[in-house]
């Protein structure tokens, strides 16, 4: 079973030793009592470590209290606080205790002093140029409107990348998407239809006003 010294019942830095019946605390200078809980030290003895501020205990019978500076704890400010043990960094951020301050190193997709801001969250995300935000799998993506691309739809898409204009047609990015300037002898939105020598095209019915070689929108 658990021993009487388990959990260290001795306060104020006292050391515990087991006895046949129970336990015994060996108290540091200035403390006494079964568990070293009674202080015989006053502020005049300077009991507060690490820059702690001592309050009370002007006469020998009165106790004192140490007000500890940030980063320290214990009745005499003798223990350094592991502020990272409180897990202040959210969303899997790495906690760094720098002594004077705490810093969180955030995982990709998160930001803020405590990694509290989810950059991949549609709620705080705007997709430019009429794009819509789509969440999924803990991340987001922008579904961009025609003619735009990139993470936030801020980049003009390259509609000519796939060389959509056939038979030597020249492709131009256009506000409406793309436009093909067809080489002579071809017509259609992508210059896909040959124009027959007699002027008729291979189209089932040529759109009105269409001329051979006309760039098509």
């Amino acid at each position: 079973g658990p021993g009487p010294c388990d959990g260290n019942p001795c306060a104020n830095g006292g050391s515990c030793s087991e006895t046949p019946r129970s336990f015994e605390c060996t108290c540091p200078r200035g403390f006494y009592g079964l568990r070293c809980e009674v202080s015989g030290v006053t502020c005049a003895d300077g009991p507060c470590f690490n820059g702690g501020l001592c309050v009370g205990g002007a006469d020998p019978d009165s106790a004192y209290i140490c007000h500890c500076p940030p980063g320290f704890q214990g009745s005499n400010c003798e223990k350094r606080v592991d502020r990272c043990s409180l897990q202040p960094c959210r969303n899997g951020g790495l906690c760094l205790d720098l002594g004077h301050a705490l810093r969180c190193r955030c995982r990709a997709g998160f930001a803020g002093p405590r990694c509290e801001h989810d950059l991949d969250d549609c709620a705080g995300r705007a997709c430019a140029n009429g794009g819509t935000c789509v969440e999924g799998g803990g991340a987001h993506r922008c579904s961009c409107a025609l003619g735009f691309g990139g993470r936030d739809c801020r980049e003009r898409a390259d509609p000519c990348a796939a060389r959509p204009c056939a038979h030597g047609g020249r492709c131009y990015a256009h506000f409406s998407g793309l436009v093909c300037a067809c080489a002579p002898g071809y017509m259609g939105a992508r210059c896909e239809f040959p124009v027959h020598p007699d002027g008729a095209s291979a189209l089932p019915a040529a759109p009105p006003g269409l001329r051979p070689g006309d760039p098509q929108r």
Partner: antibody, heavy 123, light 111 residues
């Protein structure tokens, strides 16, 4: 405001090589049709050299006389280069970068020009 | 393909009219793919007219382009001192590839 600036001009020996750079600001090539080079010998007229698609296809067009010695390429979304080899005294000229846009079913409309960079070929 | 411009130079008084001709050795693309440019000394050219007759942005209506196929004309009316420059026509063609050609230029002198 949309701008083009050429750089890389200077004095070069006959049979030497030179690379000119055209840098755009205020727009990116991918949304602007084609980027082209045009040159002008001192006191002479304009002479078209080559064009390259502003998009990722990299399609190019060259004047017949420029094929082989001149090479146009796009090095980023805002820079285009013209590599010139085996230069002769006849290549002495101001070299302009120009943007070719599609307007009303017509092409090779150079609606934006850089100030030009002077290339002098001399021994 | 050759574009021949005439005459050069051409001169006229302030308020007058000049006409510049551009003759192509063969029809330009779509019969209308011809542009006109204005160039002043030490400056790059400036697009004036595209599609043979359409006015480029910011160009005054005193500049007028006309023609089709192989014969084109640039007319400048109500001449101003600022119109003194060299004017170039530019045609676009397709023959197993796209290419463009400039005319030799016409100098306009305003008296």
């Amino acid at each position: 405001q949309e701008q083009l600036v050429e750089s890389g001009g200077g004095l070069v020996q006959p049979e030497g090589s030179l690379t000119l750079t055209c840098t755009a600001s205020g727009f990116s090539f991918s949304s602007s049709g084609y980027m082209c080079w045009v040159r002008q010998a001192p006191g002479k007229g304009l002479e078209w050299i080559a064009c390259i698609s502003g998009g990722s296809s990299g399609d190019t067009d060259y004047a017949n006389w420029a094929k082989g010695r001149f090479s146009i390429s796009k090095t980023s979304s805002t820079t285009v280069t013209l590599q010139m080899t085996s230069l002769t005294v006849a290549d002495t000229a101001t070299y302009f970068c120009a943007r070719d846009v599609y307007i009303d079913s017509t092409i090779f409309n150079f609606n934006l020009w850089g100030p030009g960079t002077l290339v002098t070929v001399s021994s | 393909q050759v574009l021949t411009q005439t005459p050069s130079p051409v001169s006229a008084a302030v308020g007058g009219t000049v006409t510049i001709s551009c003759q192509a050795s063969q029809s330009v693309y779509n019969n209308n793919n011809l542009a006109w440019y204005q160039q002043k000394p030490g400056q790059p050219p400036k697009l004036l007219i595209y599609a043979a007759s359409s006015l480029a942005s910011g160009v005054p209506s005193r500049f007028k382009g006309s023609g089709a196929g192989t014969q084109f004309t640039l007319t400048i009316s109500d001449l101003e001192c600022d119109d003194a420059a060299t004017y170039y026509c530019q045609g676009t063609y397709y023959s197993s590839g796209w290419y463009s050609t400039f005319g030799g230029g016409t100098e306009v002198v305003v008296k």
